[in-house]
Each structure stands twice: as C-alpha cells, then as structure tokens.
C-alpha cells in the first residue's frame, strides 16, 4: 500500500480511537488533561495530567527502515493497546508527558527512538513518504 494511503488510514483510525477513548475516560472539551491527537506521525490517546503515554514506533518508520526490527509489540489496531507492556528503555518506544500546560514533545524524538539509517536513505525514493 502506498504511504499516502497508509497514513490517511492511520489518521482515520486514530480519530476513531480517540473518540472511543474519550467516551471510556469521560473526557470532553472542558476536561483537565491532554486531548488525544494525531500529530501527523502517530496517534496519542487522551491522558490525565501527570500521565506518561508510551507508543510503539509508527508506521512511517517501517517505510523509512524496512529492515528495522523492534522488540516491542505494535499498538493494537482496535484500541490503544496496553502501554504498560512498553518500556522507554526499549528501542522503538516514544513517550509524551501530559502536563498542566498540555503535551510535551516526544521523548526521545522519533529518529532517536525509532532508528534512522541516514546513509541508506540517500538512495531511497525521496517522494515515497510524502503524506500530503
């Protein structure tokens, strides 16, 4: 499947997941905490202040690094999966903290967490991963 299609599908699934999570957690626009979001790279579930959310490396990096193998499991498609099974010390895990001021930036940043072979990428199709 072309990357454009992958990401449109991922985004649509993300918005559905967020809606379900909001209902389960009793979240609404006036709730304290951090709303679920699609950051154009991956999906982040809603969270309470003080909560750290962990996700596996997104699909984008399976396109960037097709040979990369991560030890962590992929977040389930039907929901957000069990983030308790993920550990920040694992390669392939990214976190965001929900603070009083909103979401922190990813830690580590995606490239550091998910790996990126810069040399290998030089030979790749430079338009392959445009998300438009």
């Amino acid at each position: 499947m072309h990357s454009d299609c992958i990401f449109k599908k991922e985004q649509a699934m993300c918005l559905e997941k967020i809606q379900r999570a909001n209902e389960l957690m009793g979240f609404n626009d006036s709730s304290p905490g951090c709303p679920g979001m699609w950051d154009n790279i991956t999906c982040w579930k809603p969270a309470h202040v003080g909560e750290m959310v962990l996700v596996s490396c997104p699909e984008l990096f399976r396109i960037f690094n097709p040979d990369q193998v991560w030890e962590t499991e992929t977040i389930g498609e039907s929901d957000f999966g069990d983030s308790n099974s993920l550990d920040l010390s694992d390669m392939g895990v990214v976190s965001r903290n929900c603070t009083e001021d909103g979401w922190s930036e990813p830690f580590p940043h995606y490239f550091d967490a998910c790996g990126f072979d810069e040399y290998e990428s030089e030979t790749g199709d430079q338009d392959y991963y445009y998300l438009s």
Partner: antibody, heavy 120, light 107 residues
Framework: QVQLVESGGGVVQPGRSLRLSCAAS????????MHWVRQAPGKGLEWVAV????????YYAESVKGRFTISRDNSKNTLYLQMNSLRAEDTALFYC?????????????WGQGTLVTVSS | EIVLTQSPATLSLSPGERATLSCRAS??????LHWYQQKPGQAPRLLIK???QSLSGIPARFSGSGSGTDFTLTISSLEPEDFAVYYC?????????FGPGTKVDIK
Amino acid sequence: QVQLVESGGGVVQPGRSLRLSCAASGFTFSRFAMHWVRQAPGKGLEWVAVISFDGGNKYYAESVKGRFTISRDNSKNTLYLQMNSLRAEDTALFYCARGYDVLTGYPDYWGQGTLVTVSS
Amino acid sequence: EIVLTQSPATLSLSPGERATLSCRASKSVGRSLHWYQQKPGQAPRLLIKYASQSLSGIPARFSGSGSGTDFTLTISSLEPEDFAVYYCHQSSRLPFTFGPGTKVDIK
C-alpha cells in the same frame, strides 16, 4: 556531508518584509524537520521556528508569531523564512539548522547564517 | 515558555583545568536537554544530546549529566580550543528555548 547555506539577508527598513532561504545538500532533506534560529549581534541564540519533514507541522517563538512564516520546498531542497512587519529587534544573524527528527527534533547541523539588519 | 538559566555567565579557567557549567530549567524538561558550543564567527556545534548522550566526533572530555530541571556540562581538562560559549537547549516543550550561554575564557 551535510551542508546548509542561508541567503536573502540584508538591510531593510522597519515594517518591511524579507524572505530568507536555506539551500540544503548532503542529506535527504525531505525526511528531516528544519529550524530557524537567530542571534542578535553580541547576544545569545534564540529559537525562531521549526517545520516538520512534510511541512504539516509548523511552530514559532512567541516573538515572531503572526509575523514570520516558515515553509519548505522539498523538491528544491530549500527551507524558507518569510519575515513581515520587521522590527529593529529582529536584527540578527539567522541560522537554518537541521532538526534530527521528522517532527521537530533538536538542531544537529547548522549553516553559517545570513545577517538581517532592520534599520531606518 | 520554559526559561533556561545558565551559570556562571563567564567562567575564567586555565588550560588543563576542569570546567563545570550549569543549566537550570524553569519547569521539568525530562532529559530533552542538549548542549552546544559556539566559537567566535562560527555556527554552533552540537556537543551532547539528551543531557548525557555523547556524539561521535566530540572529544570524550565533554560529558553531561542531569534530568528534570538541573543539568551540568563538564569539560574534564580544558584544551585551548575549548574556550568558547556554551549553550543549553530544551526540546521538551514548544516553543523551544536556549539558555543565555556561559562563556569559558582563558584566565
């Protein structure tokens, strides 16, 4: 090797506009976030803006929000900074830097900068 | 925005001495704190990422530590080429910010 070359700086009057460019080579430009960082003469570094690899995410410092626009043309391996309503306090050496990430990241390689002087 | 404070503003030392530079954040930045070196007339150079991670090509005398709000850059034994300005930078919260810098000069 990674190379970033800024251009477009110069002397401009307050209230006018200027567009800076940054030509990138030596890496796959379209996979990296890019930053603009500035440095007023004899002062420290000030982060200005960042744009994600595909241009879908753009973030700005409060001091430039609403006046500056960051953009990129991945087909030309070029980063831009459109600066409108320039003020004397915008006088600085403007650096473009590669962000080591798709979304934002920290600057890991820097250009040599282009000087913008806002003066009447 | 997160404000980074660096101390001291200037550090006067001799070659061979140990330099200890501090960076304090107004709110926790976890470990998303990076250190840069800038020499006169040159662009900044990334020295340390994520508070303590070393980078290839950077001499082993440079090391970093800390997390949350308090961070330290240590130069174990100053070489003549190390006299420069050092900046910390946080990439934990937008807008990103830099500290005001610490100038390490020759005593």
